[in-house]
């Protein structure tokens, strides 16, 4: 048999008019019950019994996982990155078969010079991390390589990385146009064939806090939304206070249902409250008060 827990009750009336009695104890306070039989059925919404309590799945909480949280943790990555696949043609080095072997002295030296050259080319780009040669082939030396970009996550990270990729394109085009062979000789660190410069592909980290929020909110996805504070995204329901989208329930408690957030209005000893936002107070008559 279930143990009886003495708690005072407060009568709550939903905005639709039904009166609900709820315990006035904090829902997060553990309530000890002595339960006989299968515990699994006690945990709702996919929660499971760990021997002591219900372990709830997002977005649920509560003794039986019956309540919906007001906010869901979403963790954007600290940094976001972009990878640009580029090809340039170096004319100041003649291709030899040893360049195909990434552990050869030839490759290591070429890699060192090429990296130095690209570090100079991209030195003014704060997002620039480095280059990675993926393949060298004949012609003089066709260099297939990745340019790596990284920036701190902000809501505008895509714009920042898109801008950086544009600057990379401008800078590589400029250097491969200016640093060219003269009389079969190169006076620069490396010389290039202007027509051999190509951007093959650009891959940008995909992180969408709205999508993560919706996924974690599951069947409540239409009612959870993302708001930012100090450039950090928060996945909240209207029942979470302190945000632009927060629902003000005045004399009531905000509760999530599958139809969205609703206010459960309080009935006190002196007043009952109604209305969508529990802002309409009606004083109880004297005799009703003493009944």
């Amino acid at each position: 048999p279930l143990a009886t827990i003495p708690v005072s009750t407060t009568s709550l009336t939903s905005s639709e008019g039904s009166t609900i009695s709820t315990p006035s104890v904090d829902i997060s306070t553990p309530v000890t019950t002595s339960i006989v039989g299968d515990q699994c059925s006690r945990c709702k919404n996919g929660g499971f019994w760990d021997g002591l309590k219900c372990q709830c799945l997002t977005p649920y909480y509560g003794e039986s996982c019956e309540e919906v949280v007001n906010s869901i943790d979403i963790a954007p990555p600290e940094t976001v990155s972009a990878q640009m696949e580029l090809t340039v043609t170096v004319t100041s080095v003649k291709f030899t078969d040893e360049l195909k072997n990434h552990s050869s002295q030839e490759f290591r030296e070429f890699n060192k010079t090429f990296t130095e050259q690209m570090n100079i080319v991209y030195s003014g780009i704060p997002e620039y991390v480095g280059v990675n040669i993926t393949n060298l082939r004949l012609g003089s030396v066709v260099v297939e390589h990745d340019v790596l970009l990284r920036t701190k996550y902000t809501p505008e990270y895509k714009t920042a990385l898109d801008n950086a990729t544009e600057v990379v394109k401008q800078k590589i085009t400029k250097v491969t146009t200016e640093q060219i062979m003269t009389n079969d000789n190169c006076s620069a660190l490396m010389c290039f064939n202007t027509t051999g410069t190509q951007v093959q592909n650009i891959t940008v980290t995909q992180y969408d806090p709205v999508e993560e929020c919706r996924q974690k909110a599951e069947e409540y996805e239409d009612y959870f939304l993302v708001e930012y504070r100090d450039q950090k995204p928060y996945c909240i329901s209207p029942c979470e206070s302190g945000f632009n989208a927060s629902k003000n329930c005045n004399h009531g408690k905000c509760q999530m249902s599958q139809n969205g957030a609703r206010c459960l209005c309080v009935t006190t000893e002196t007043h009952w409250y109604s209305g969508e936002d529990c802002n309409q107070g009606t004083q109880k008559s004297h005799h009703h008060h003493h009944h």
Epitope: V93, K94, E106
Partner: nanobody
């Protein structure tokens, strides 16, 4: 570690000749490139001549027709034959080597260096 040792410098009169040598510790660069650079006091190091394993040679405009670069792979030695020397040729001469078949007279493109040998040309 690859060692390069330059020698053969000295003092000559304008119009005179010198032959510089650069001995490599092994034949590592026989499939790459070797070069001569020079640096006059207060000036940047500049490329003088290159020779590559494919037989290609390249020269700075200022020495074309007067200097000849060559190498003896059997002896692992690089040479620079200098004739018609001018006071402007006065500098410290360095040999450099690369595993790459290079076409670059920019010193930053070269990773292995010998210590210098001084050439002084007086008028």
């Amino acid at each position: 570690d690859v060692q390069l040792q330059a020698s053969g410098g000295g003092s000559v009169q304008a119009g005179g000749s010198l032959r510089l040598s650069c001995a490599a510790s092994d034949n590592t660069f026989s499939r790459g490139s070797m070069s001569w650079f020079r640096q006059a006091p207060g000036k940047e190091r500049e490329g003088v001549a290159i020779i590559s394993s494919d037989g290609w040679t390249g020269y700075a405009d200022s020495v074309k027709g007067r200097f000849t670069i060559s190498q003896d792979n059997a002896k692992n030695t690089l040479y620079l034959q200098m004739i018609g020397l001018k006071p402007d040729d006065t500098a410290m001469y360095y040999c450099a080597a690369s595993f790459l078949v290079l076409r670059a007279l920019n010193p930053k493109a070269w990773h292995y260096w010998g210590q210098g040998t001084q050439v002084t040309v007086s008028s």
